[in-house]
Every structure is written in C-alpha cells, then in structure tokens.
C-alpha cells in the first residue's frame, strides 16, 4: 500500500500552565532524509496551521522563533509540545507528516489529538 500511516494519541490534557505534549509517530514507506511536520487545528470545519517544521533525519526539529511549538525527533517519532494554550484553544490537533526528500513524496495525516485546556482558577486575594 503506497501510503504513510501516522499515529497520535486520541486525547491529551494540557497542564495548568497551558502546555500540552504528544507523540506523532509515522510508518515510513520510504527512506526519507528530509521530513516536514505540521500541526493543524481543526475547529468545526475551520482548519488552521498551528506550527510547522522541516528537519533532516538525525537532526533536531527547528520551529520558527515565534512558534508556540517545540519538538524533538527520534527515528520515525516526533515529540511535540505546544505551549501558551488557553481554554479557548481546546480542539482537535492533527499531525501531518510529509516525506519531502528523496522522491517519492509521501503524505501522512493523523486522526488528531483532542487537547483539552482548562484555564487555572485565579488565586484568591489573601489578607495577611
């Protein structure tokens, strides 16, 4: 089957500091040296790009400086962390993997990770 399977967890709960981490794993049909990983957020029928990084196999993922994502790679596995999340960012986060080089190109799209974000309760004022 000329297709690439991408696996990611179904559900992740963000920390109280608005940080969510999950693993995106892909079964590569070819020996890629250059891989692009994109995180998409789907809310209703709207899809937006959260972040993207292209990396050479064996090297680290490098997101743009202003990206809310960080990540590390190990073989066919990418560990993704999204920070700065708030309750309104709760949604389905989809991992998209593309084997860019060498040919042939392959596309793999995960089923998505539902990330739940709960805003922390504000600390009550304390009188001393």
């Amino acid at each position: 089957c000329k297709a690439m399977h991408v696996a990611q967890p179904a559900v992740v709960l963000a920390s109280s500091r608005g940080i969510a981490s999950f693993v995106c794993e892909y079964a590569s049909p070819g020996k890629a040296t250059e891989v692009r990983v994109t995180v998409l957020r789907q809310a209703d029928s709207q899809v937006t790009e959260v972040c993207a990084a292209t990396y050479m196999m064996g090297n680290e993922l490098t997101f743009l400086d202003d990206s809310i994502c960080t990540g590390t790679s190990s073989g066919n596995q990418v560990n993704l962390t999204i920070q700065g999340l708030r309750a309104m960012d709760t949604g389905l986060y989809i991992c998209k993997v593309e084997l860019m080089y060498p040919p042939p190109y392959y596309l793999g799209i995960g089923n998505g990770t539902q990330i739940y974000v709960i805003d922390p309760e504000p600390c009550p004022d304390s009188d001393f």
Epitope: C1, K2, A3, T38, V47, A52, E98, P104, L107, I109
Partner: antibody
Amino acid sequence: QVQLVESGGGVVQPGRSLRLSCAASGFTFSSFGMHWVRQAPGKGLEWVAVTWYNGRNKYYADSVKGRFTISRDISKSTLYLQMNSLRVEDTAIYYCARGGYYGAFDIWGQGTMVTVSS
Amino acid sequence: EIVLTQSPGTLSLSPGERATLSCRASQSVSSSYLAWYQQKPGQAPRLLIYGASSRATGIPDRFSGSGSGTDFTLTISRLEPEDFAVYYCQQYGSSPWTFGQGTKVEIK
C-alpha cells in the same frame, strides 16, 4: 478572498519557450504546496509539477521532466512554470492549484491556454 | 505510479435521479488521500470530496463519497440541473499525483 490567477499563455512554435505565472492572494503563500495541472483539449486532468513551502523541493511528471521548471517567489506570492523545448503534445489549459492542508487541491486558478503549433 | 480507472465513462441520467460513480485504483490507496472534483465546460475543476468522504467547504450534502483500499464511490443522491458535469477522482498520498480519466454525467 482566496484566489489564484494565471497568465502567460499563448501560441508558440515547437521547440520554443514560454513562462506561465500564477498570482496568489488571500492566503499565506509559503504555507502551501503549489501545483501545476494541465488539460489537453477534450482530455482529462494531468498533474505537471509541484513546489513546496520554501521552494527548494520540486517534483515533476515524467512527461515534462528536464524541460519544465517550477518556481515560486514568496515575496510576490507568485508561482511560475518555465516551459522550454515545447512540443505539440504540451498544448493544453494550464491550471495552478493549491495543495490544501489535507493535501487535496482545494483552490484552482481559471487556467491559461498554451498552444504549441508550427 | 497509481493508476485510477473511472467507470462508467458516461452516465446518462435525469434530474432527480441518483448517480453512482466509481473509481478503482491499481494499488491500495489510503482513504485519507482520495479526492473527487467536478468540472463544468469552460471552468476550472472544483474540489468536492477529500479524504474519500469529507465534503469540501460549501459542497451540498447530496454529494457523498465512500470506499477504501482500491474501490471508491462518489454518489449524488438527487441530481440537480447544475450537477451535470465531468467528475474526476484523484490520489494525493504519494507522488506522482494522479487523476482518473473522468466520468461525464449528462442529461438523459
């Protein structure tokens, strides 16, 4: 709104060159793969070429490899197709199309006609 | 290269009828990477279905896609006058990107 507009088509003799342009607007050009697809008169759709995000990785159909060059100017949000050594069988409407977030071609230009004839 | 074969070549139907279009792949295609397009004379193709069964933005629900492996189907539940056109399937999971030869849905 999201839009692709092709230009540069025309009538050209076999062996000559032509450069097509596709001006994109309404979306972040660098976030999408951009394709050229052609359609010979009365025929079906044939994928021609693609250039990715940074413009470094490019793929071509065997029928145009070595003759056509795809490129993009991110600062101008414009896609190009340089067509050299044109053949009669290259006669077609050429469409540029955006590879959407999920990979399918979700936005298409109106097409530009290229006729290769002596 | 994945070859896509569409059938029938032409489908002659009346408005209000159900249209069933078939797309068969030469090798297994993940349903995540199969699309259907509509093309009317003198117009560019328009994306109808992606991921074998997800409707693109603004596509009416009379259009539906199904299938997996090597066999995929586009169904138009009740043909409207504006649905008479040529329909193409496409795989986009690996290069080269390939299209079927098309099915023409014409008025009977």
